[in-house]
């Protein structure tokens, strides 16, 4: 059936907190005002409507909910809690809705939620318990399989006096709730580093997107536990070289494809191991496109075409011979 739109102001209140319950039970197939609903597709779209809250009268059949392009600002605890619960909701897209605050337990009472997209929201305040729902050391497992967090970094002047990377990682690791996560996208977040413990605690990952960040090094990151990892996107970062430990770990992952385009590779003596590895490995996609950025004399040289004689380091002069 084609999407239907309802402008009904039927008063069904099934709000985000236990203290506010339905005034009267919502009709099972009712479509909220300003939304489009297709019961056949189990889909509700409330898109670009400047909503400041999640609609209260969502139909019980909803499996795919699009709330993109709104002005939600804050997701409180139980923002999607309803009586009866939205038991079928599997995919929730909140991208581009001006969210800057996601509180503990915001996605509680969504037992089937497998895909969550919070991309393009300036998340200055992401609770450590946003996805786990509780501050217990071990929480009930989250049903989430895909978590899309691309471009959630707030503008510099809105960031709190803490590490943005740390805030995001705390939410990913809290209560070990995301052990079943298979896809994690963290592109375009100005990440300078990847905290060393994050990947070890997400053992089910198949797809990890860290593209378009500012990662300089993977020295302290371990991929060893990610035995199911199929794709690793590291394009458009600030990587200078991959060292032996990282190369060996990547080579040891049975299903992996790695994407390394558009990094400022430094083609000096420290690059020799990586060049040797690139020539032998099948895991790097588009490896023939990787080029040197530094030093100047090596700029735009293709990594695969380099040999050990090309990769030299300027000798470090002893202090007594250095000039100011």
């Amino acid at each position: 059936s084609s999407p239907t739109s309802s402008a009904s102001s039927f008063s069904s209140s099934a709000p985000f907190l236990a203290s506010a319950v339905s005034a009267q039970p919502p009709l099972p197939d009712q479509c909220p005002a300003l939304c489009e609903c297709s019961e056949a597709a189990r889909t509700v779209k409330c898109v670009n409507r400047n909503l400041t809250e999640v609609p209260t009268d969502l139909p019980a059949y909803v499996r795919n909910l699009f709330l993109t392009g709104n002005q939600l600002a804050v997701l409180p605890a139980g923002a999607f809690a309803r009586r009866p619960p939205l038991a079928e909701l599997a995919a929730l897209n909140l991208s581009g809705s001006r969210l800057d605050e996601v509180r503990a337990g915001a996605f509680e009472h969504l037992p089937s939620l497998r895909q969550l997209d919070l991309s393009h929201n300036p998340l200055a305040d992401l609770s450590p318990f946003a996805f786990s729902g509780s501050n217990a050391s071990v929480s009930a497992p989250s049903p989430l399989v895909e978590l899309i967090l691309n471009h959630i970094v707030p503008p510099e002047d809105e960031r709190q006096n803490r590490s943005f990377e740390g805030m995001v990682v705390a939410a990913l690791l809290a209560g070990r709730a995301l052990q079943g996560l298979r896809r994690l996208e963290l592109a375009s977040n100005h990440f300078l580093y990847l905290p060393r413990d994050v990947l070890a605690q997400l053992p089910s990952l198949r797809h990890l997107d860290l593209s378009n960040n500012s990662l300089v090094s993977l020295t302290y990151v371990s991929f060893r536990n990610l035995t199911h990892l199929e794709s690793l996107h590291l394009e458009d970062n600030a990587l200078k070289v991959l060292h032996n430990g990282t190369l060996a770990e990547l080579q040891g992952l049975p299903h992996i494809r790695v994407f390394l385009d558009n990094n400022p590779w430094v083609c000096d003596c420290h690059m020799a191991d990586m060049v040797t590895w690139l020539k032998e490995t099948e895991v790097v996609q588009g490896k023939d496109r990787l080029t040197c950025a530094y030093p100047e004399k090596m700029r735009n040289r293709v990594l695969l075409e380099l040999n050990s004689a090309d990769l030299d380091c300027d000798p470090i002069l002893p202090p007594s011979l250095q000039t100011s």
Epitope: A33, L34, T52, P55, A73, V74, A77, E101, R103, A124
Partner: antibody, heavy 120, light 111 residues
Framework: EVQLVESGGGLVQPGGSLRLSCAAS????????MHWVRQAPGKGLEWVSY????????YYADTVKGRFTISRDNAKNSLYLQMNSLRDEDTAVYYC?????????????WGQGTTVTVSS | DIVLTQTPLSLSVTPGQPASISCRAS??????????LHWYLQKPGQPPQLLIK???NLESGVPDRFSGSGSGTDFTLKISRVEAEDVGVYYC?????????FGQGTKLEIK
């Protein structure tokens, strides 16, 4: 000038019904969420209900849940509160108030109020 | 529900003197993004009017002798020099969650 004018109050017996109205002018009504807030005689302020700008969200205080229904007609710049099964403790001045959002908002404009008296 | 407790419940102030009202919340009503606490004045026989939004932001048209401060659970409304027109009942209100609640009110009188 922002104006909110409540009407529909009066004397009603316990168990009876009333419908309050709030007429808005001086601003784009459809861009704002609206609240009802009440004040019992000699008492403080009590939030009653909220409706979002496009009637997608409705919230109620526990004390009125299941008895009161909030609604709005953006074409008529009007807010309503249908009050059923009225009780003595519902006696109060009822104010309508404007907000830009529920949690990130505040009551930035108020009507003069309409008095509801529930008594046998 | 979040309980807001105001102190004192009444105060009598000489014109030109300062006044201070406290509002304490039963749980934090601040995040790092926003403070969900607002102040109102209800003058005798009138509806309430917004004075301070988000703890410290003066509403347009409100005299700058009014100021607000605080975060978390403890908030303060200050009047630097009380004037006769400031009499009435002052309320704090949170918007952290449903239900929205008000403090019980503080009655300001002029000596």
């Amino acid at each position: 000038e922002v104006q909110l004018v409540e009407s529909g109050g009066g004397l009603v017996q316990p168990g009876g019904s009333l419908r309050l109205s709030c007429a808005a002018s001086g601003f784009t009504f459809s861009n704002f969420g609206m609240h009802w807030v009440r004040q019992a005689p000699g008492k403080g302020l009590e939030w009653v209900s909220y409706i979002s700008s496009g009637s997608t969200s409705f919230y109620y205080a526990d004390t009125v849940k299941g008895r009161f229904t909030i609604s709005r007609d953006n074409a008529k710049n009007s807010l309503y509160l249908q009050m059923n099964s009225l009780r003595d403790e519902d006696t109060a001045v009822y104010y309508c108030s404007r907000t830009n959002s529920l949690l990130r908002g505040f009551f930035d404009a108020w009507g003069q109020g309409t008095t509801v008296t529930v008594s046998s | 529900d979040i309980v807001l407790t105001q102190t004192p419940l009444s105060l009598s102030v000489t014109p030109g003197q300062p006044a201070s009202i406290s509002c304490r919340a039963s749980q934090s009503v601040s995040s790092s993004s926003y403070t969900y606490l607002h102040w109102y004045l209800q003058k005798p026989g009138q509806p309430p009017q917004l004075l301070i939004k988000s703890a410290s932001n003066l509403e347009s048209g409100v005299p700058d002798r009014f100021s607000g401060s605080g975060s978390g659970t403890d908030f303060t409304l200050k009047i630097s020099r009380v004037e006769a027109e400031d009499v009435g009942v002052y309320y704090c209100q949170h918007s952290w969650e449903i239900p929205l609640t008000f403090g019980q009110g503080t009655k300001l009188e002029i000596k």
